[in-house]
Interface confidence: low
């Protein structure tokens, strides 16, 4: 067991051009806080995977109001360290996500409004008990400077916090076969208290008689690799060909512990040691709380923190789901106007506009008729992206230079015959139909079925997004 500690030194504009605007203003004073999420291993885990090593939220920093006209300085930071306790061994390699959040302190009666300013991530190797490691990470125009370390909580020591130390029983030396515990030379390495046979490489214990497995290992003595496909052979003795230890029949056979729990045999049955966020006989009950950092992708956890999962994740733009685990296809909302192409860049939406349009959502219609000419009496029409001509009767094409056949589009409905005419076209309707395009049936009693007025459209309820 131990604690991962993170000290934020500064958060402010990074070097180079394009300094970011201050996130706070006189109209909207704000303060910063930070969230750290830790995951074991160096693998490129999906952003939505849980903070399996733990997560922590800092205190709020001092209230900050931008000085008008001044560039954004390093912003005032919260006091103290962010501490992420870890119950099991320190893995040595880990991934981190550090998020900088802004809490706006306007006159919202409902309390503060939060928004994610920056997120940095990385993968590092770190031995517990070592010195502070310094780091600089950039997110867009922002720069975050911080230090971190992992330290063991007594009586644990060592680079993985798996060795146990106890105060010396005698002032001068440790007991037989026991070494002093560097760097605590006044303490001795504790006698072996783990279950007999517990793997020294893959197992550890915090209490006598225990054998708890490091990630990737299972079995009562932590000697069985998890999910080793070559080991999934029928039950039998240790296989020399696969190099796998195939356990004989026992209560932990097949690992009855769900959700990554590790199984230990007991005299009468088995016992599951559950990972954070789960409990129950087989670790089948989710007891995730805000303390477990259940909100992914920078979601902010609020609400109760009881074992019934009484928390709510407020998701940043672009994510949804009860844990903000799903990326929203924001382009499905068709935010780009006038035929613009939508690009979801994750941190923002971009619209690639067609010629003749501009603006964040291609909403601005440029003057595409400037310097354009339409032949044969055609008039140039704004709003089509590229220049568009509305042609006089009898002409067509991009610039109205082509003589048009008005009957080419078969405009006469219900089998009517089309005749080109100097004023446009004329439809000669088949029996039983009438109208300029033969669109209306003539009833036997002579009344025509003209279309009813279109029904009133009831707009859908507006969607709300957190």
């Amino acid at each position: 067991a131990g604690v991962f500690e993170l000290q934020i030194h500064s958060f402010g504009p990074g070097p180079g051009p394009g300094a970011p605007r201050s996130p706070c203003s006189a109209r909207l004073p704000c303060r910063l806080f930070f969230r750290v999420c830790l995951k074991p291993g160096l693998s490129e885990e999906a952003a939505e995977s849980p903070c399996a090593l733990g997560a922590a939220l800092s205190a709020r920093g001092p209230v900050y109001t931008e000085q008008p006209g001044a560039p954004a300085p390093d912003l005032p930071l919260p006091d103290g360290l962010l501490q992420v306790p870890f119950r099991d061994a320190w893995p040595g390699t880990f991934s981190f996500i550090i998020e900088t959040w802004r809490e706006e302190l306007g006159d919202q009666i409902g309390g503060p409004a939060w928004s994610l300013l920056a997120r940095v991530a990385g993968r590092r190797r770190l031995a517990a008990g070592g010195p502070w490691a310094r780091d600089i990470q950039r997110a867009g125009a922002w720069e975050l400077r911080f230090s971190y370390r992992a330290r063991c909580e007594p009586p644990a020591v060592g680079t993985a916090c798996t060795r146990l130390c106890r105060p010396r029983s005698a002032p001068s030396r440790c007991g037989p076969g026991l070494r002093p515990c560097a760097p605590l030379e006044d303490e001795c390495e504790a006698p072996l208290v783990c279950r007999a046979g517990c793997s020294p490489e893959h197992g550890f214990c915090e209490q006598p008689g225990e054998c708890r497995c490091l990630e990737g290992w299972t079995g009562p003595l932590c000697t069985v690799p998890v999910s080793t496909s070559s080991c999934l052979s029928p039950r039998g003795p240790s296989s020399a060909t696969t190099g796998c230890l195939v356990p004989g029949p026992g209560p932990c056979d097949g690992n009855p512990c769900a959700n990554g729990g590790s199984c230990s045999e007991t005299p009468r049955s088995f016992e599951c040691t559950c990972p954070r966020g789960f409990y129950g006989l087989r670790c089948e009950v989710s007891g995730v709380t805000c303390a477990d950092g259940p909100c992914f992708n920078g979601g902010l956890c609020v609400g109760g923190a009881d074992p019934d999962s009484a928390y709510i994740c407020h998701c940043p733009p672009g994510f949804q789901g009860s844990n903000c685990e799903k990326r929203v296809d924001r382009c499905s909302l068709q935010p780009c106007r006038n035929g613009g192409l939508c690009l979801d860049l994750g941190h923002a939406l971009r619209c690639r506009c067609r010629a003749g349009f501009a603006g964040p959502r291609c909403e601005h219609d440029l003057d595409d008729c400037a310097g354009r000419a339409c032949a044969n009496g055609g008039t140039c029409v704004e709003g089509g992206g590229a220049h568009r001509c509305s042609c006089a009767l009898g002409f067509g094409g991009r610039d109205c230079r082509e003589r048009a056949d008005p009957c080419a589009a078969r405009p006469c409905a219900h089998g009517g015959r089309c005749y080109a005419h100097f004023s446009g076209l004329v439809c000669a309707c088949a029996p039983g139909y009438m109208g300029a395009r033969c669109e209306f049936p003539v009833h036997p009693d002579g009344a025509s079925a003209l279309p009813a007025a279109p029904p009133g459209l009831r707009p859908g309820d507006p969607q709300r997004y957190l």
Partner: antibody, heavy 116, light 107 residues
Framework: QVQLKESGPGLVAPSQSLSITCTVS????????VSWIRQPPGKGLEWLGV???????YYNSALKSRLSITKDNSKSQVFLKMNSLQTDDTAMYYC??????????WGQGTLVTVSA | DIQMTQSPASQSASLGESVTITCLAS??????LAWYQQKPGKSPQLLIY???SLADGVPSRFSGSGSGTKFSFKISSLQAEDFVSYYC?????????FGGGTKLEIK
């Protein structure tokens, strides 16, 4: 301006049910949670439960079998129903708008007396 | 359920004095703690949230500190209107539980 107003029956006979309505204004029930809390005369506060903006509810485990919290977002109303009342359920009942997991803005309360 | 033990249950003090009220949680609750003030015949009003943050419109003579299991609430210079009741509430784990309350009285 955020406001919460509780309206209840005032007097309830023992073993009967209690229904209280909390009518809110100045915010949307789809965006914020609402808690119910009670306070017996001259005593401390007891949290009864919460309904979140998304509709999920959480109850005080000691009272869960007797409690129901529902809401009508369109009418801006939250409802507390409590069964099998006894005299020790006599209390001031408050609804409160949750500020996430940080605390709450309370209504004025409604006094419920359980008596024959 | 998490028990919140608030002390003292009542305290006498004079105008201008400082007083401190303590709340102990039966298990660690991080900083998920709020402090409320309740005047006679009125509903409680939020003073402090997240253990240390002052709610909107609350005078700066009120302050909160602590994390984990031990929390303190301090009024630095008592005014006449401060002699009322105060409650802590944990919001870490439902059921969100309150302390028993502290009644401040004028000496």
């Amino acid at each position: 301006q955020v406001q919460l107003k509780e309206s209840g029956p005032g007097l309830v006979a023992p073993s009967q049910s209690l229904s209280i309505t909390c009518t809110v204004s100045g915010f949307s029930l789809t965006d914020y949670g609402v808690s119910w809390i009670r306070q017996p005369p001259g005593k401390g506060l007891e949290w009864l439960g919460v309904v979140w903006g998304g509709g999920s509810t959480y109850y005080n485990s000691a009272l869960k079998s007797r409690l129901s919290i529902t809401k009508d977002n369109s009418k801006s109303q939250v409802f507390l129903k409590m069964n099998s009342l006894q005299t020790d359920d006599t209390a001031m009942y408050y609804c409160a708008k949750q500020r996430g997991q940080y605390g709450a803005y309370w209504g004025q309360g409604t006094l419920v007396t359980v008596s024959a | 359920d998490i028990q919140m033990t608030q002390s003292p249950a009542s305290q006498s003090a004079s105008l201008g004095e400082s007083v401190t009220i303590t709340c102990l949680a039966s298990q660690t609750i991080g900083t998920w703690l709020a402090w409320y003030q309740q005047k006679p015949g009125k509903s409680p009003q939020l003073l402090i949230y997240a253990a240390t943050s002052l709610a909107d419109g609350v005078p700066s003579r009120f302050s909160g500190s602590g994390s984990g299991t031990k929390f303190s609430f301090k009024i630095s210079s008592l005014q006449a209107e401060d002699f009322v009741s105060y409650y802590c509430q944990q919001l870490y784990s439902t059921p969100w539980t309150f302390g028993g309350g502290t009644k401040l009285e004028i000496k």
